[in-house]
Amino acid sequence: EICGPGIDIRNDYQQLKRLENCTVIEGYLHILLISKAEDYRSYRFPKLTVITEYLLLFRVAGLESLGDLFPNLTVIRGWKLFYNYALVIFEMTNLKDIGLYNLRNITRGAIRIEKNADLCYLSTVDWSLILDAVSNNYIVGNKPPKECGDLCPGTMEEKPMCEKTTINNEYNYRCWTTNRCQKMCPSTCGKRACTENNECCHPECLGSCSAPDNDTACVACRHYYYAGVCVPACPPNTYRFEGWRCVDRDFCANILSAESSDSEGFVIHDGECMQECPSGFIRNGSQSMYCIPCEGPCPKVCEEEKKTKTIDSVTSAQMLQGCTIFKGNLLINIRRGNNIASELENFMGLIEVVTGYVKIRHSHALVSLSFLKNLRLILGEEQLEGNYSFYVLDNQNLQQLWDWDHRNLTIKAGKMYFAFNPKLCVSEIYRMEEVTGTKGRQSKGDINTRNNGERASCESDVLHFTSTTTSKNRIIITWHRYRPPDYRDLISFTVYYKEAPFKNVTEYDGQDACGSNSWNMVDVDLPPNKDVEPGILLHGLKPWTQYAVYVKAVTLTMVENDHIRGAKSEILYIRTNASVPSIPLDVLSASNSSSQLIVKWNPPSLPNGNLSYYIVRWQRQPQDGYLYRHNYCSKDKIPIRKYADGTIDIEEVTENPKTEVCGGEKGPCCACPKTEAEKQAEKEEAEYRKVFENFLHNSIFVPRPE
């Protein structure tokens, strides 16, 4: 039986009965918030073999092992993850071991096992046999291994039953509990699963199978399941569904999303039955189950019941997320806010058409209107008194409307009005008249030449760069010394720079009047020698990264024809030099024969240039005679050969803080103080833990349904 679409068992342990007939949970399984310690021994679900999304366990009192509950759970597919994880075991106060002895494969995602004070048998599981990459696993804050004394079956009797693998240079037995080994398939099976008797399964099987080389005997499928068979792809006239099975058109045509209160059915796209058309596609008509590409952003019409939508906060802007056509009027009144420009762009940046008018008033937090980055048409079907369809009044910090070199905006009907915008140059308004096609519609008083731009540098001279030099993490630039009519009016220069992967940034990107600014700023004093050109060394930059840079002269407010004179440069794009890449990630090696090693790795996180090739070096290691002098059946850990590397194991320091030998020097010493990098890493780690815990709480604590 397929159960789903995600099972949430909370508060009452008897809800576990819902799992009674499940063989596959199509979705997630949550078992959480059961605060009364219960006896779970009577609950056993041997039929459950697959969870298609993730398994989350959180604060279940009295549960000591998962092995009795789910003795045959073989695969967690991770089709959807919980914060990047397919298995989360968090704050399970009584859990002593995981015990999922039949768990063979976590197809996607990592594991997070954290804050389980009594949990052992963690170091005895080789997760690399279950997951593709173990580097993202997070196993922290459980019972210390030294207090666990984990023993695999048969070890004490000196008749070990489990197989050994190496983890972190430690060659040891692998088991889930004191009486359950971790199953490993013969090397002859390669990546294939195997039966209990170590016979290789069919290549389409995942996890395990009941008979060898038979695609109808799989416990789970590597790719897709259809009519009792594991198949590499869905057959004709069937469609992939929920990442693991094939369904027919009729099935797909009759299902609805349970997450929505509308009855917009599923669609078929690219061989998959899915809830929505993917990004960039739209349904091909109201009765259609198929998707067609959108021309440009996909249209989404939004309507305001009261006709006029007031945007006075990020929250009110949020309602317009994804809207491309707004039926009604926009009244923008943003007096304050944090990171307001980028937040508004996030929520309003797709709007292309406003059917009514746009009014911007008392928006002292705005420096630019570029957050409406796709607005191309104001229809003016409804206008303000006086026939205005674009109205800009009393915005103390507004300096730019849009970047008119890259903007095509039409105002179909109605006039424009501008007053009391002291930093908005009249030339900017006149430019808008030309672009929008409203020139000639405005009467004399509609654009006030005295109180618009009265406090701005409206007559700007251009500063020219004279030289640029780059290294891997530095840029040196110089520019012509600006000479205003009265040299005493020049105070200094400000250099603005930021990462710019594309050559499409403007001065006002991400900038608002409340201190948020996507540009880094550096002040540059005037060189004392009048003949020396001003310049700056920008350091601490990333290698092989394109930066945008511009310079502004800081001048006294020298009034000339009622306006201030200033100077600034064009935006210059400049790339730092390439550098050595960071190390390749997740290096794994395995032997597939007596004369071959297969080595796999992921690209470096910081390529610092265009990667052209990798260098793989290897060398033969002498067999370590030390390994033969140890009794492998003893409970002790296998001693690992230590190399003097000038650092000390922190755990050893706590035991005997005064007698450790530091590096090559004799004599007692204490743990070395943490470096800045280590402190930073610890801080980030703590932050990451908090973020996850918040995510967990926000996801699982939900209002009681009505």
């Epitope: 995600g6 299902i255 609805l256 349970a258 997450e259 209160s261 509308d262 009855s263 917009e264 809830q275």
Partner: nanobody, 128 residues
């Protein structure tokens, strides 16, 4: 408080027509999917037809395809079911239902669990 009131039921001869209406109040009608269900004496409640809010996409049970038509008027907050070529087996109590969010995943349009609000029903009797 959400309220759904069905009307338009009655006694009709086989082959005849009826038009059921369901007027909703207490909700933003234009954002909810809606459906008609029916329950004959001694039988399970079954889905007859459903309609989405945004696009007007429609769904029909095989037994009524080609005979029944579902529609809605968002301005009037009303859902309709036009029933033609009625058969005696269409005799049942007809209920109007409104979708609700119901956790994760999916369900079939004719599953009652996907609907959060229900009307009192209107009786349709088809005589032979």
């Amino acid at each position: 408080q959400v309220q759904l009131v069905e009307s338009g039921g009655g006694l009709v001869q086989a082959g005849g027509s009826l038009r059921l209406s369901c007027t909703a109040s207490g909700l933003t009608f234009g954002t909810f999917g809606m459906a008609w269900f029916r329950q004959a004496p001694g039988k399970e409640r079954e889905g007859v037809s459903a309609i989405s809010a945004s696009s007007g996409r429609t769904y029909y049970a095989d037994s009524v395809k080609g005979r029944f038509t579902i529609s809605r008027d968002n301005a009037k907050n009303t859902l309709y079911l036009q029933m033609d070529a009625l058969k005696p087996e269409d005799t049942a109590m007809y209920y109007c239902a409104v979708r609700s969010k119901n956790g994760a995943g999916y369900g079939f349009w004719y599953e009652a669990r996907l609907y959060g609000y229900w009307g009192q029903g209107t009786q349709v009797t088809v005589s032979s």
